[in-house]
């Protein structure tokens, strides 16, 4: 009789495993854009290609107006790479003339916007110096980590200088997320 106490454990009902192919996911790629006005202390957000070439959105993950929209709550892996390019000749001009419009560093930020919270949240940030590298420089910044997100959250990528972003190839600059 004692053994029967354990019998029900063999009849436990397990929730069926969800197929990975059903989970929300998106991979967005670089798209050409003209630099726009932005507030002094706020980095501009990038637009993304969402359906051409390597880009896609699947399973209710949608892209609209710079934002990736999270369709259901859960743990997501979020990633982005932004490749910047420029010329070091700009750096000596910065140091000599103190020109604030030519940066000596580049920054990428992945930002979360939640309607119920007034301020955007910085999830990931990466910064590199660009005035130490060669004459025609290329610098990728890659960011990626897991975050717990809520349905309705919006993700965007902000950069310190849109004009330095390399838009020439879709495998150089990209942004994505998928539900784990």
């Amino acid at each position: 009789l004692k053994g029967q106490e354990f019998a029900p454990s063999h009849q436990q009902v397990y929730a069926p495993l969800r197929a990975d192919g059903d989970k929300p996911r998106a991979h967005l790629t670089v798209v050409r854009q003209t630099p726009t006005q932005h507030f002094k202390n706020q980095f501009p957000a990038l637009h993304w290609e969402h359906e051409l070439g390597l880009a896609f959105t699947k399973n209710r993950m949608n892209y609209t107006n710079k934002f990736l929209l999270i369709p259901e709550s859960g743990d997501y892996f979020i990633y982005s790479q932004v490749t910047f390019r420029g010329m070091t000749s700009e750096c000596s001009e910065i140091r000599q003339a103190g020109r604030p419009n030519k940066p000596d560093s580049i920054t990428v930020v992945i930002t979360k916007v939640t309607d119920s919270y007034p301020e955007p949240t910085q999830l990931l940030m990466g910064t590199k110096s660009v005035c130490e590298v060669g004459s025609n420089w290329f610098q990728p910044i890659y960011l990626g980590a897991m975050f717990s997100l809520q349905e309705g959250d919006k993700l965007m990528v902000n950069v310190s200088d849109i004009s330095l972003v390399d838009y020439t190839k879709e495998d150089k600059t990209f942004f994505g997320a998928f539900l784990l």
Epitope: R32, Q33, T34, T36, H47, L52, N65
Partner: antibody, heavy 124, light 107 residues
């Protein structure tokens, strides 16, 4: 790298049809939009239509009923057929891969990549 | 359909000159304008998109400006290889109309 290679020159009689091919490499026709533009002597550039990546088409109303765009995904080739040819259809026909760009929050289309062009001469 | 009107239809200039070509749309195209260079027997080459952004690999002597319905392409100092025909194109909606072209000739 992105390349669009078009078929060779054609000479056609009025009333006939012509089918120009555009074989692409460096991208898939199922993932990018391919447009057709022509340049008639002294007429400038004229947009004819597009084969969208999803296989639907959109034609300039000027050519509606005379133009048909198709594709073969196995060979990564797009075709443009123009029927009921007349002398004023004598032109160089180009295929082009469209590119999207943003200004503020609106997006627009331009043509960063072009085929080499196909001369179609319509003459009796 | 949106109509695109370029002026002048032709212009004569010398190497080193500054040249300006204008393009007017029949309605507001919200800076959705591209400029192309076309040489005889060659395919068009994209120079400018978004009215003012230089396409990758295009020399900085080319610049674009404008908004609403009126747009300008400027070549700051003409080089021998710049003698060609230039077209504007609206990218807002089908049928993505081109201007009739401006032929830039050697004076």
């Amino acid at each position: 790298q992105v390349q669009l290679v078009q078929s060779g020159a054609e000479v056609k009689k009025p009333g006939a049809s012509v089918k120009v091919s555009c074989k692409v490499s460096g991208f898939s026709v199922t993932r990018y939009n391919v447009h057709w533009v022509r340049e008639a002597p002294g007429q400038g550039l004229e947009w004819m239509g597009v084969m969208w990546s999803g296989a639907n088409t959109d034609y300039n109303s000027k050519f509606q009923g005379r133009v048909t765009m198709t594709r073969d995904t196995s060979t990564n080739t797009v075709y443009m057929e123009l029927s009921s040819l007349r002398s004023e259809d004598t032109a160089v026909y180009y295929c082009a891969r469209a590119g999207r760009y943003y200004v503020d929050s609106n997006y627009y289309w331009d043509f960063p990549y072009w085929g080499q062009g196909t001369l179609v001469t319509v003459s009796s | 359909d949106i109509q695109m009107t370029q002026s002048p239809s032709s212009v004569s200039a010398s190497v080193g000159d500054r040249v300006t070509i204008t393009c007017r749309a029949s309605e507001d195209i919200y800076s959705g304008l591209a400029w192309y260079q076309k040489k005889p027997g060659k395919s068009p080459k994209l120079l400018i998109y978004g009215a003012s952004s230089l396409q990758d690999g295009v020399p900085s002597r080319f610049s674009g400006s404008g908004s609403g319905t009126d747009y300008t392409l400027t070549i700051s100092s003409l080089q021998p290889e710049d003698f060609a025909t230039y077209f504007c194109q609206e990218g807002l909606k089908s049928p993505y109309t081109f201007g009739q072209g401006t032929k830039l000739e050697i004076k």
